[in-house]
Interface confidence: low
Amino acid sequence: SAPFSFLSNVKYNFMRIIKYEFILNDALNQSIIRANDQYLTAAALHNLDEAVKFDMGAYKSSKDDAKITVILRISKTQLYVTAQDEDQPVLLKEMPEIPKTITGSETNLLFFWETHGTKNYFTSVAHPNLFIATKQDYWVCLAGGPPSITDFQILENQA
């Protein structure tokens, strides 16, 4: 498993919510849904009402990082996507409010958001070589690449 690479000297300060109520679809056109209280999974849906709606909050790095750093929250909840380790499912962590400052071990709440055309990638700040990914018969997890699917389409205006 990939070792945690917490950048304890880097501080991330919350700026603002930059996207509300969007859906994430993977390259197989599967939408992210709630599997249970703790975990997410992906499924092909006929009705997108069942898909998880996310909000995206932007953070600014104290080391002037060119990457866009974000937090992912399930809309209208206090549940935040939290990275664990490689091939481990991401967790939904409940917090009373969006963190104003994140540093050290709390960077497992943050992801670098990269876009390539219509493809969106979310790399873990705590594990810079691992992506949010979907995997057949598994939860949404952290993975380095195939066979897991690491690219997503963002569907907006899904309120």
Epitope: A35, N36, D37, Q38, Y39, P89, D137, Y138, W139
Partner: nanobody
Framework: EVQLLESGGGLVQPGGSLRLSCAAS????????MAWVRQAPGKGLEWVSS????????SYADSVKGRFTISRDNSKNTLYLQMNSLRAEDTAVYYC?????????WGQGTLVTVSS
Amino acid sequence: EVQLLESGGGLVQPGGSLRLSCAASGFTFVRYDMAWVRQAPGKGLEWVSSIYKSGALTSYADSVKGRFTISRDNSKNTLYLQMNSLRAEDTAVYYCAKGWASFDYWGQGTLVTVSS
């Protein structure tokens, strides 16, 4: 009507093994995560293990990790718990439950007694 029927409990010596089964009916078994929880005499409920709907992922309490194995046969609508290297502290009523971490249905339980 959802029904969960546990079986396989009994008296076993320390270090012994048992296999618990849970026959599920009244819901689409393959669509749901399942779990085992237990209640020792005079104590509260303790989560033991959970398994994802496809069986692709499992999770265990630290107290049973390496000794217990959860599995399921979706073609038979049955959940299993293989218990090896049993200890006195494993003595409890074992319940099959529908769900991963929060449960909407439970079985009646099967008693496991570990004693010499």
